[in-house]
Amino acid sequence: IINGSDCDMHTQPWQAALLLRPNQLYCGAVLVHPQWLLTAAHCRKKVFRVRLGHYSLSPVYESGQQMFQGVKSIPHPGYSHPGHSNDLMLIKLNRRIRPTKDVRPINVSSHCPSAGTKCLVSGWGTTKSPQVHFPKVLQCLNISVLSQKRCEDAYPRQIDDTMFCAGDKAGRDSCQGDSGGPVVCNGSLQGLVSWGDYPCARPNRPGVYTNLCKFTKWIQETIQANS
């Protein structure tokens, strides 16, 4: 997250970290059910671990943390590497979470976002770009949903209805390492960090997010079929 600020503790209990061994964070994810996460399809790895209820980036033990294995990862069948359409994936955890103030699911919004909606994006991704500098704790940033026209103008021929753009002033954006993490609008999960320009936070080059309102049926049906 570029030019965000430290999230208040316990305010993002759905935020998950996807880790490669030993404890390398490579993507964010979102708890949407007691045993299921959503993340970006481009975050798929065969071997990874899931950390929930953790505030700092470092692997130091925190009393609220819960660790999991992913037993199933189900990318949206319409995703096409290295493209960006349909960039979402469900991960089934090896057990249900223990709900606490630090670990709690969030509902996926069935309403599509309108321009001007205020949202919050969070993650442990780099706080500088193109340099790489990772934060000590989870970062939060207020962003506004842009109109689809502004989105398409920013990225001609690259935007479809499975994506939306959001941003703020130049210099504020999500970035590498935030992928798969949540965009929360009006208390519901509206999007996932998907892609954007490089370096991040360039003028007139907003972040692009998976438009989850288009996938509520797929999410529900996939969880039901695999539970």
Partner: antibody
Framework: EVQLQESGPGLVKPSGTLSLTCAVS????????MSWVRQPPGKGLEWIGD???????DYASWAKGRVTISQDKSKTQVSLKLSSVTAADTAVYYC???????????WGQGTLVTVSS | AYDMTQSPSSLSASVGDRVTITCQAS??????LAWYQQKPGKAPKLLIY???TLASGVPSRFKGSGSGTDFTLTISSLQPEDFATYYC????????????FGGGTKVEIK
């Protein structure tokens, strides 16, 4: 050097159990999923199953109930057991490492197991 | 079922030819497809993963493309060392799968 080496008896009697081990060197089993694949003489590749560092195991549907895959991370080896074998289980058996992006990037040389009385 | 069907099962070609092998999945596997080359008496070798990413050390004449259900491996200019059997493998799911591999395509000298 990253290496995989399968070993086990080359001949197994019908109705017996085929047991193979795959010795792993040059990388930690805790970081990778491992696969077993077989190839009957003159035929194509057949996936048998995968084992993950967490000891979660996926088996091919034909292998469920007959196959057991396990690992010993301290001994850095992966094992395959196939019970109630018939002549149709005669094949070259390979172990392989997944590159974490769903491609098998390191393979053992394979070991031929013949099922015959 | 996620069955993988390769075609053709065999083909004859000459050095320098452009060769195309196809792999079709019975359901969408997104981009989780790998290609392997196998020579007689040897273990398979990974060529391409994620449908189009070249594995380390693989010559650039090998190219993978496709997504969803239809995938292609193209060898732009066949070299003598490319005569071998090629297999595709889906990595989308392991649930209730008989085989993740396609049946293979043997590339022979014309």
């Amino acid at each position: 050097e990253v290496q995989l080496q399968e070993s086990g008896p080359g001949l197994v009697k019908p109705s017996g159990t085929l047991s193979l081990t795959c010795a792993v060197s040059g990388f930690p089993l805790s970081n990778y999923a491992m696969s077993w694949v077989r190839q009957p003489p003159g035929k194509g590749l057949e996936w048998i199953g995968d084992i993950y560092p967490s000891d979660i195991i996926d088996y091919a549907s034909w292998a469920k109930g007959r196959v057991t895959i396990s690992q010993d991370k301290s001994k850095t080896q992966v094992s395959l057991k196939l019970s109630s074998v018939t002549a149709a289980d005669t094949a070259v058996y390979y172990c392989a490492r997944d590159n974490n992006d769903y491609g098998l990037d390191i393979w053992g040389q394979g070991t031929l197991v013949t099922v015959s009385s | 079922a996620y069955d993988m069907t390769q075609s053709p099962s065999s083909l004859s070609a000459s050095v320098g030819d452009r060769v195309t092998i196809t792999c079709q999945a019975s359901q969408s596997i997104s981009s989780w497809l790998a290609w392997y080359q196998q020579k007689p008496g040897k273990a398979p070798k990974l060529l391409i993963y994620l449908a189009s990413t070249l594995a380390s050390g693989v010559p650039s004449r090998f190219k993978g493309s496709g997504s969803g259900t239809d995938f292609t491996l193209t060898i732009s200019s066949l070299q003598p060392e490319d005569f071998a059997t090629y297999y595709c493998q889906q990595g989308y799911t392991n649930s209730n799968i008989i085989n993740t591999f396609g049946g293979g395509t043997k590339v022979e000298i014309k």
